[in-house]
């Protein structure tokens, strides 16, 4: 039975050409984690598994690192990377998770952060 | 290529003991999950086992928990799968497969090997 | 344990043709659902992971859709070489589940 709740950054923005930090929580639950998936869209930028540490995607290699923690930092923003991303807890026993951040890449210096949310 | 082999099957009594090895070639065999899946006479599957890359972590559905044991030897790029206290339901083809990085499916299978539990 | 019920068990259809194979989770497996072939010799490929995405090399006539509880494979235009049998599996809990397979004949 999954008992665990994902909080995540939420909805958040930042400027072109800077930087920002995915995190999510996996709280609730005594389950281990095996991996963690960050994803956009379906794309796979990056993994964190329990016996090897991070992989990041080759393609994006050059704009994302690792952390903290089990985040993912983004860098060197451009508009194009407005959108969806996921991060995917697996866990055993209770099975995966998902949690949801929506980034908004701004042109102007006017980037504030969303509040945060909590996904069952 | 990717290839998986498996090997070591055969016809056992019921309470008896089968290893199970997958010989691993075509890619680099200790960064990947591995699983043994198994399919019924009746032809279906089921999952029996699962190994994290580096060993830390084995799952097991409770049909085959405490009777079964996945291994592997990165060093070998060889998988196993220790069968003890073996039971008529147990008979079927066993295969070894390797999970995708993301851990979304299974992307390569093995051809299987056969495992006969009947005195 | 999640049930995974696929229908139909067997189909039969003529080179050219559209079909659908459809799984039904017993509870919502959001998109941890892959399809699977299988044909003589034991030969497994997977086709399709994470509902939709297109596994490497497996040609465009295959495709998968469906989110929750309900999932279908489509295969146009089918080929002699579709003669298979075809599983779903779930990946949202343990113990990892399969359906019960759909075998494919041609008319």
């Known amino acids: 039975m999954m008992t665990g709740t994902i909080e995540t950054t939420g909805n958040i923005s930042a400027e072109k050409g800077g930087s920002i930090i995915l995190q999510c929580h996996l709280s609730s639950t005594t389950a281990q984690v095996t991996q963690v998936n960050w994803e956009q869209q379906d794309q796979l930028l990056a993994i964190c598994n329990a016996d090897l540490g991070w992989h990041i995607s080759p393609s994006f290699k050059d704009r994302v690192a690792p952390g903290p923690g089990l985040g993912l930092t983004l860098q060197s923003l451009t508009v194009n990377d407005t959108g969806e991303y996921f991060c995917i807890y697996h866990t055993y026993p209770d099975g995966t998770y998902t949690g949801r951040i929506f980034l908004e890449v701004l042109e102007s210096s006017v980037a504030e952060h969303g509040a945060r949310f909590q996904i069952p | 290529e990717v290839m998986l082999v498996e090997s070591g099957g055969g016809l056992v009594k019921p309470g008896g003991s089968l290893r199970l090895s997958c010989a691993a070639s075509?890619?680099?065999?200790?960064?990947?999950?591995m699983s043994w899946v198994r399919q019924t006479p009746e032809k279906r599957l089921e999952w029996v086992a699962t190994i994290s890359s580096g060993g830390s972590y084995i799952h097991y559905p409770d049909s085959v928990q405490g009777r079964f044991t996945i291994s592997r030897d990165n060093a070998k790029n060889t998988l196993y799968l220790q069968m003890s206290s073996l039971r008529s339901e147990d008979t079927a083809m066993y295969f070894c497969a390797r999970w995708l990085l993301g851990l979304y499916a299974m992307d390569y299978w093995g051809q299987g090997t056969s495992v006969t539990v009947s005195s | 344990d999640i049930q995974m019920n696929q229908s139909p068990s067997s189909l039969s259809a003529s080179l050219g043709d559209t079909i659908t194979i459809t799984c039904h989770a017993s509870?919502?497996?959001?998109?941890?659902l892959s399809w699977y072939q299988q044909k003589p010799g034991n030969i497994t490929k997977l086709l399709i992971y994470?509902?939709?995405n297109l596994h490497t090399g497996v040609p465009s006539r295959f495709s998968g859709s469906g989110s929750g509880t309900g999932f279908t494979l489509t295969i146009s235009s089918l080929q002699p070489e579709d003669i298979a049998t075809y599983y779903c599996q779930q990946g949202q809990s343990y113990p990892r589940t399969f359906g019960g397979g759909t075998k494919l004949e041609i008319k």
């Open positions: 075509g890619f680099t065999f200790s960064t990947y999950v």
């Open positions: 994470k509902a939709s």
């Open positions: 509870q919502n497996i959001n998109v941890w």
